[in-house]
């Protein structure tokens, strides 16, 4: 797959951390947010500290997504829920792909047809309701340096 030029981690060796990012969802302009209690949603506030995310390359094209302030890892659960866990599990890895429109998608490595996605209201979308071509799965990585 193509690799993100700015926001992706796919071109970097395993264990490599890039600068913190904010993931901007095309569907409504929400930034992906990881709360300290493990909840995941979207917010339209660039100053929210919980949108600062660390993308770490596990292997080429595979990343984990950690909320810097929450100190938790984004996870796709077997029922399609998105939440953030304190420890890295096999549910915390995602295939990162740069799509032709320059947005990234993050597809679960464990549940391979499910994507990280935000609804138009800012709530997360169940993995089981996601699929290719949806605006909800498209994310633009942006710098989170402050």
């Amino acid at each position: 797959p193509a690799l993100p030029e700015d926001g992706g981690s796919g071109a970097f060796p395993p264990g490599h951390f890039k600068d913190p990012k904010r993931l901007y969802c095309k569907n409504g302009g929400f930034f992906l947010r990881i709360h300290p209690d493990g909840r995941v949603d979207g917010v339209r506030e660039k100053s929210d500290p919980h949108i600062k995310l660390q993308l770490q390359a596990e292997e080429r094209g595979v990343v984990s997504i950690k909320g810097v302030c929450a100190n938790r890892y984004l996870a796709m659960k077997e029922d399609g829920r998105l939440l953030a866990s304190k420890c890295v599990t096999d549910e915390c890895f995602f295939f990162e792909r740069l799509e032709s429109n320059n947005y990234n998608t993050y597809r679960s490595r464990k549940y391979t047809s499910w994507y990280v996605a935000l609804k138009r209201t800012g709530q997360y979308k169940l993995g089981s309701k996601t699929g290719p071509g949806q605006k909800a799965i498209l994310f633009l990585p942006m710098s989170a340096k402050s």
Epitope: G29, K46, S47, R120, T121, L140, S143
Partner: antibody
Framework: EVQLVQSGAEVKKPGSSVKVSCKAS????????INWVRQAPGQGLEWIGY????????KYNEKFKGRATITSDKSTSTAYMELSSLRSEDTAVYYC??????????????WGQGTTVTVSS | DIQMTQSPSSLSASVGDRVTITCKAS??????VGWYQQKPGKAPKLLIY???NRYSGVPSRFSGSGSGTDFTLTISSLQPEDFATYYC?????????FGQGTKVEIK
């Protein structure tokens, strides 16, 4: 081509209300937030708030909370900004502006022509 | 609220001059600053977004730089159509706030 066409100039008495409209065309109205910004004569720009036409959810500058009401009508692709309890300091040009979205994020990339509101007794 | 302080408030320049306008935020706003151009009786127009990115169709003589608290708009070679008022704006913290404007006049 994106167009935002605003309603005409208004002259209002202190204490009354004004409702300015902004009709959008050339894009999918529910995909982008509409901001409202005002400019007093000879002064700078001041953000009032925005409305998301998708679910009619609004966010306000605290300064205008309780006095400004920003709404939208999906069926006519029109955004509205109503300001109540008008005072002379509210005399200004009021602009609607669409957010850019995508790589432009929240930058305002298309603006209405402005509506002059004069508050005078 | 975040204060955006522009300087100078006005300047006189000639066609072909290099013009620099600065904007200082009262606290860090990351790189989330835009620049707008406004001519008398007209609505503002977006020039620069996210600190340093030129908006579609904006001439290359306009450039933006900076992050944190200090931002700059540069016009490399002033053209007759560039005489206008320029505003910086931050959208990092709510409420979004603008600078007071810099009027660029003909010398």
């Amino acid at each position: 081509e994106v167009q935002l066409v605003q309603s005409g100039a208004e002259v209002k008495k202190p204490g009354s209300s004004v409702k300015v409209s902004c009709k959008a065309s050339g894009y999918t109205f529910t995909n982008y937030v509409i901001n409202w910004v005002r400019q007093a004569p000879g002064q700078g720009l001041e953000w009032i708030g925005y409305n998301d036409p998708y679910n009619d959810v609004s966010k306000y500058n605290e300064k205008f909370k309780g006095r400004a009401t920003i709404t939208s009508d999906k069926s006519t692709s029109t955004a509205y900004m109503e300001l109540s309890s008008l005072r002379s300091e509210d005399t200004a040009v009021y602009y609607c502006a669409k957010e850019g979205g995508g790589k432009y994020v929240y930058a305002m990339d298309s603006w209405g022509q402005g509506t002059t509101v004069t508050v005078s007794s | 609220d975040i204060q955006m302080t522009q300087s100078p408030s006005s300047l006189s320049a000639s066609v072909g001059d290099r013009v620099t306008i600065t904007c200082k935020a009262s606290q860090s706003v990351s790189s989330d600053v835009g620049w707008y151009q406004q001519k008398p009786g007209k609505a503002p127009k977006l020039l620069i977004y996210s600190g340093s990115n030129r908006y579609s169709g904006v001439p290359s003589r306009f450039s933006g730089s900076g992050s944190g608290t200090d931002f700059t708009l540069t016009i490399s070679s002033l053209q007759p159509e560039d005489f206008a008022t320029y505003y910086c704006q931050q959208d990092y913290y709510s409420p979004w706030t603008f600078g007071q404007g810099t009027k660029v006049e003909i010398k």
